[in-house]
């Protein structure tokens, strides 16, 4: 039961996380105009990974896409790539994990296969989450660098009374959405990996038991295989006894070979 819950929760958390990563990637507010010195502005600038926008005090909003590919900063391209890789891996992970869910039966799929799929999706979620966190962090670092650079030369003189005030940008909502979403996807992935260990019992998971037969002492070592005394009919190394109490999740888990915690 605990394994099913862990797997299901991991799936749901990852699903929310990946939805968040997609949302963050599509959002326009990766960076927003810094309003520290001027909380009320007639023209409010904000930028995303794909376009930059202006919200006028008139209430109108206008956005302009980045129609160039080569003209964009390498860092922005890198962030885009990280976010897209994160989304792709996350989407594949979700697809794999749906088939891996214990509560869903697909034909005669063995639990060992489900365990492997759960592990695979868990790893994909972890990498997806890390990609998103890395992408957002790279962008945030870029913002911090640019912020202090534009603060240092806030006014670039143009001679006489004319000044160009540089627009300073600070963290937008998308960054926080991305960090949280990446974290959730990462946590979901870890939960899937934990769940996968409990999906199938390992053959080395059974308690030792002793049988006292008349004349000979036959000891059964952990794993349920007969000791090499030359006695008994378990020559094919079949599992003959499970000394431990079985949880609900383990009831149908043999004859699987692997047991992931």
């Amino acid at each position: 039961m605990a394994v099913t819950a862990c797997q299901g929760l991991g799936f749901v958390v990852s699903l929310i996380g990946i939805a968040g990563i997609i949302a963050a990637t599509c959002m326009d507010q990766w960076s927003t105009q810094d309003l520290y010195n001027n909380p009320v502005t007639a023209v409010f600038n904000y930028q995303g990974l794909w376009r930059s926008c202006v919200r006028e005090s008139s209430g109108f909003t206008e956005c302009r896409g980045y129609f160039t590919l080569l003209g964009l900063p390498a860092m922005l391209q890198a962030v885009r790539a990280l976010m897209i890789v994160g989304i792709v891996l996350g989407a594949i992970g979700l697809l794999v994990s749906i088939f891996a869910l214990k509560c869903i039966r697909i034909g005669s799929m063995e639990d060992s296969a489900k365990a492997n799929m759960t592990l695979t999706s868990g790893i994909m979620f972890i990498v997806s989450g890390l990609c998103a966190i890395a992408g957002v962090s790279v962008f945030a670092n870029m913002l911090v660098t640019n912020f202090w650079m534009s603060t240092a030369n806030m006014y670039t003189g143009m001679g006489g009374m004319v000044q160009t005030v540089q627009t300073r940008y600070t963290f937008g909502a998308a960054l926080f959405v991305g960090w949280v979403a990446g974290g959730l996807t990462l946590i979901g992935g870890v939960m899937m990996c934990i769940a996968c260990r409990g999906l199938a019992p390992e053959e080395t998971n059974y308690k030792a038991v002793s049988y006292h037969a008349s004349g000979h002492s036959v000891a059964y070592k952990p794993g349920g295989f007969k000791a090499s005394t030359g006695f008994g009919s378990n020559t094919k190394n079949k599992k003959i006894y499970d000394g431990g109490a079985r949880t609900e999740d383990e009831v149908q888990s043999y004859p699987s070979k692997h047991d992931y915690v």
């Epitope: 007639a42 930028q47 202006v54 109108f60 302009r64």
Partner: antibody, heavy 118, light 113 residues
Framework: QVQLVQSGAEVKKPGASVKVSCKAS????????VNWVRQAPGQGLEWIGM????????RLNQQFKDKATLTVDTSTSTVYMELSSLRSEDTAVYYC???????????WGQGTLVTVSS | DIVMTQSPDSLAVSLGERATINCLSS????????????LTWYQQKPGQPPKLLIY???TRDSGVPDRFTGSGSGVDFTLTISSVQAEDVAVYYC?????????FGQGTKLEIK
Amino acid sequence: QVQLVQSGAEVKKPGASVKVSCKASGYTFTNYWVNWVRQAPGQGLEWIGMVHPSGSETRLNQQFKDKATLTVDTSTSTVYMELSSLRSEDTAVYYCARVWSGNAFDYWGQGTLVTVSS
Amino acid sequence: DIVMTQSPDSLAVSLGERATINCLSSQSLLASGNQRNYLTWYQQKPGQPPKLLIYWASTRDSGVPDRFTGSGSGVDFTLTISSVQAEDVAVYYCQNGFSFPFTFGQGTKLEIK
């Protein structure tokens, strides 16, 4: 068609107050900010402030923060500007105007002349 | 506050000739988000309220004759009337729509020679 109709001319004594109205029609009143601009005789244009009819949110030129109060009556689609502590230098034509894209003022009222004289 | 300076203060042009009015801003009016310049041009005839001619520095308002053209970027802007007509006699104002408070130029009076 879009129309902004202002109240008639006013003559006031120094120290008095005046409330100028601007009735809007021909568009969705709550969707657009309304500006107030003044023009002293023979002078240029001076922006006073603007108000949003949906939430009565205002933006005031600091020069007029103790002079002008902008209010809205959505039931009659009317914007009001009250000018307090009038002085002779407040004698001007006061215009209301709708704010359009680019923070431009696309439709203007006919203007209200406020004369402050003792 | 952004200071808007127009030149010349007055301009006399013969009918059919080109008229050029300049407007200089004390700060850039270019918004980085949409790469538009928040500069507006108005025409005011005697006894009338101002009329919107051009916004975003170069976008003509509906119904404005195409002889009126706005140009420029950043801090330097121009309103050009390619062929002046008698009905163009008015005072022309530029306005900053980029930052509060919105400010106007002092106006340029256009007359017929």
